[in-house]
């Protein structure tokens, strides 16, 4: 599509908008130079134009009065200072703080639970299809197919651990070689990064918040995609991951360890198992070509079963099929053998909502998908609101400084590595990179964590999830120990390699630049975020999957020209930004291309036409749905909800009143009140510290 959005006649200027090192402290925006982010193009009121979306490579001359949109907002305190309060006020403030903390933890709990249920919903909707992806025999010979299968399966089941465990069981059963499994693991790494991208979509209501949240989430995507882009060809050529991990596995005499500690699951499971319980073995069985599993439901019905082993006589085609020569006989017509049969006797049903409904998996999955997304969205909004009211003034300053400030010179470079360790540790504690990165996303959105700091935390999260896998591997039974350990180590070394590629040298931190570029685009054209999600996690993998099935020739025939065009565009962009004089005048900018090929504006018009019908209604829906609607309709006052429809009608009559951007207010809570998102409250009663 567009090489980048709207670059018209822009002249490159390499000196502007370069990212600083991780942890750089950006200055607060000057209130006098505020940008209006409402995007009401036809309003009669004079306002400063929206920032154009900057790409990662093209650096544009901009009016000096416009602030860097990546600067963190100042969360100023408008409440009464602690010292000025009377005893009653202090007590009230203390209990308010405690209340907020309890609410925050409560919403955080349901947020994590909804992520778990979201994963279950995806498994119910697409789990069986995901299992069938694995039963494709071409995986063995085609690493690219393995990669996209890893992506698609993980996206469909919303869990890299599920897809990885399927791979492990297939390797243990010799249905898959470690060599063929490595690209699948790489794909699973990519697929798992969709969760926090979905979470970022929930913050669509506020442009600047969305810009940061979406960039913060997609930094994970870009890291994974770029790592695969470099490391998959390297692995195919050298098999370095396979060789290193094989040496490690063979050099140690591992004994079966303990199970990986379930720390977060201990708290969330009591609740999530009341909603739905899944029999995840079904997906593995489908992957391993078990025909009977295709008709089984993923919804677990019986939780307490009694397994009785017994021997039964069965007929076999010939004596060669007998269990053993001594367990072989004939009745004169047929050959018989004795087979060990495990009889499963159902004793007690599971205690979850869907146990007695006998609904098809797709129906249960769809219900849970909608509900979990609503809960996820609701919890996220509430977390952001509570954090917004808590993180003000001194509290905000302390937290932001603690998280985003580097160590003193000459140890500043160590800060990022500590963040990697923190990310790994936190992920190990919560046992899920999705949960950790998803929890990080709203914090990036509201401006508590910079993208530069979120990046190493995310990289650490990638490492953390592999250490969990290594522990799980050490706890696996003898026959699966070697293969599961080798695959877990492949996953680990793949992420280490990725970090070595895209982290140590600030210049190589491409994922940050790319994520910021995407954040800018998505903040201006919010529909592009959904478009990105569909393209990168569904369409591209499905296209590669389809082409791979058609055979190598078709894949190469289509792939080579596409790759060639991409390389050509990237080289041209690099030359345009670095040394445009080398190029002929016509190629010094993209004006020679039709508008739809170089700008998202025409596409935006098309999308707006399609979503126009939602504009009148989008804000009249409930507050939770509101944000989802905004994503589609690009409604400027989307989250007012109360007077929104009337305002929209007024706006159409040309009586629009500009809505102040959040940065113009003293703090986030007030900015949201002005936009009608929070019922107006007396800001004097706001409590500044817990």
């Amino acid at each position: 599509m567009a090489p980048w959005p709207e670059l018209g006649d822009a002249q490159p200027n390499p000196d502007k908008y370069l990212e600083g090192a991780a942890g750089q402290q950006p200055t607060a925006p000057d209130k006098s130079k505020e940008t209006n982010k409402t995007d009401n193009t036809e309003a009669p009121v004079t306002k400063i134009e929206l920032l154009p979306s900057y790409s990662t490579a093209t650096l544009i001359d901009e009016p000096t009065e416009v602030d860097d949109p990546w600067n963190l907002p100042t969360l100023q305190d408008s409440g009464i200072k602690w010292s000025e309060r009377d005893t009653k006020g202090k007590i009230l403030c203390f209990f308010q703080g405690i209340g907020r903390l309890i609410l925050l933890l409560g919403f955080l709990y349901f947020f994590v639970c909804s992520l778990d249920i979201l994963s279950s919903a995806f498994q119910l909707v697409g789990g069986k299809m995901a299992g069938q992806f694995f039963s494709n025999s071409s995986i063995m010979s085609n690493p690219l197919l393995g990669l996209v299968i890893g992506v698609l399966v993980t996206v469909l089941v919303q869990s890299s651990s599920t897809s990885t465990s399927i791979v492990v069981s297939m390797v243990s059963s010799s249905l898959l070689t470690v060599r063929a499994a490595i690209p699948i693991i790489m794909g699973a790494n990519i697929g798992t990064s969709i969760t926090n991208t979905i979470v970022a979509l929930m913050q669509v209501g506020d442009r600047s918040e969305f810009r940061r949240a979406f960039a913060g989430a997609t930094v994970h995507d870009f890291f994974n995609w770029l790592s695969v882009l470099v490391l998959l060809p390297v692995e195919v050529a050298t098999h370095y991951l396979e060789i290193i991990t094989q040496l490690i596995v063979e050099s140690f005499h591992f004994k079966n360890g303990e199970d990986a500690p379930d720390l977060l699951k201990v708290i969330t499971k009591p609740f999530t198992k009341l909603i739905v319980q899944l029999d995840k073995k079904v997906i593995s069985q489908i992957a391993m070509n078990d025909e009977k599993a295709k008709n089984k439901s993923l919804v677990k019905i019986w939780c307490k079963t009694f397994t009785n082993k017994t021997q039964i006589n069965v007929t076999v085609p010939s004596t060669a099929n007998c269990t053993s020569p001594s367990l072989c006989w004939t009745d004169g017509i047929q050959n018989w053998t004795m087979k060990n049969v495990t009889y499963k006797e159902n004793i007690a049903k599971c205690q979850h909502i869907f146990v007695n409904f006998h609904l098809p998996d797709l129906a249960v999955g769809t219900i849970l998908l909608i509900l979990s997304l609503l809960v996820l969205c609701g919890c996220l909004i509430m977390i952001v609101k509570i954090l917004g009211s808590v993180l003000k003034g001194q509290v905000a300053t302390v937290i932001k400084k603690t998280i985003n400030t580097d160590f003193p010179f000459p140890f500043a470079w160590l800060t990022g590595y500590l963040a990697i360790l923190v990310g790994a540790g936190m992920t190990f504690i919560v046992q899920s990179s999705s949960v950790f990165t998803s929890a990080l996303t709203p914090l990036i959105g509201i401006g508590v964590i910079t993208i530069e700091r979120a990046y190493p935390l995310t990289l650490g999260s990638n490492i953390g999830t592999t250490t969990t896998a290594i522990l799980a591997a050490l706890a696996s039974p003898g026959n699966a120990l070697r293969s599961s350990l080798q695959i877990a180590l492949c996953h680990f070394f793949f992420n280490i390699s990725g970090i070595l590629l895209w982290y140590p040298i600030p210049f190589t931190r491409l994922p940050i630049r790319m994520a910021k570029g995407l954040g800018n685009i998505s903040a201006k054209y919010r529909w592009f975020a959904v478009f990105y999600l569909i393209i990168f996690f569904f369409l591209i993998p499905l296209t590669v999957f389809g082409l791979s099935l058609a055979g190598w020739r078709v894949l190469v025939g289509v792939g080579v020209p596409v790759v060639f065009i991409i390389i050509l565009v990237l080289c041209l962009r690099l030359l345009q930004s670095r040394c445009p004089r080398v190029l002929p005048k016509k190629l010094q900018n993209w004006n020679f291309l039709p508008l739809w090929m170089r700008s998202l504006k025409p596409w935006d018009a098309v999308v707006s036409k399609f979503t126009g019908c939602f504009q009148m209604r989008c804000c009249c829906c409930c507050r939770v749905c509101c944000r989802a609607c905004c994503l589609l309709c690009d409604c400027p006052k989307c989250c007012r909800c109360s007077k929104c429809c009337e305002d929209l009608e007024e706006a159409q009559e040309g009586q629009d009143v500009p809505v102040k951007a959040p940065e113009t207010f003293d703090n986030i809570t007030i900015s949201r009140e002005a936009q009608g998102e929070v019922p107006a409250s007396d800001s004097k009663t706001e409590c500044t510290a817990l």
């Epitope: 001594s326 367990l327 072989c328 006989w329 004939t330 009745d331 004169g332 050959n335």
Partner: antibody
Amino acid sequence: QVQLQQPGAELVKPGASVKMSCRTSGYTFITYNMHWVKQTPGQGREWIGAIYPGSGDTSYNQKFKGKATLTADKSSSTAYMQLNSLTSEDSAVYYCSISTIITTGAVDYWGQGTSVTVAS
Amino acid sequence: DIVMTQSHKFMSTSVGDRVSITCKASQDVGTAVAWYQQKAGQSPKLLIYWTSTRHTGVPDRFTGSGSGTDFTLIIRSLQSEDLADYFCQQYSRIPLTFGSGTKLEIK
């Protein structure tokens, strides 16, 4: 009770064929496999083959393939064995028998045997 | 084909004796062995199947043992009505095969 009735004796000319019967009663004919066993003083006992009357499935000892043909008539609950191109070596007592011990080849009910004599 | 060998064609015994009749298979037949008794002028009668399981109505003085290739039929205290021809049969593989038989005689 289970009974298997066989004709006492058959005298046949060399090169001719004989079809001996085994009339059953006291059980459901189609339930159990019907076995045929040859007994001679010199060769001892030899298993000829078996038929499952329910489906008509048969199984033969390789040695008797082409020599013996096993059939079953469900309507009369009778099993038959036809022996072709008889020679003096085919002179023997032929037993029909069934195995009611399901899934085994252990034969628990036997007919009285038909003595076949091949002589010109 | 599996060959069932009964080494003794005849055995001289007395009433009240403990008699052991042996049968050797040419290959492993597991426990798929049956023992029969055949009196002169009569049809065979099943005594034991699955090496050691007595058939209905068979006196408990008859016991079977063995597995794989070596099998034994033991008559604990021989009665006069037990004088007959005893033969083994394997039903491990098709064709079913029989032992040549061991005839018990009074000394």
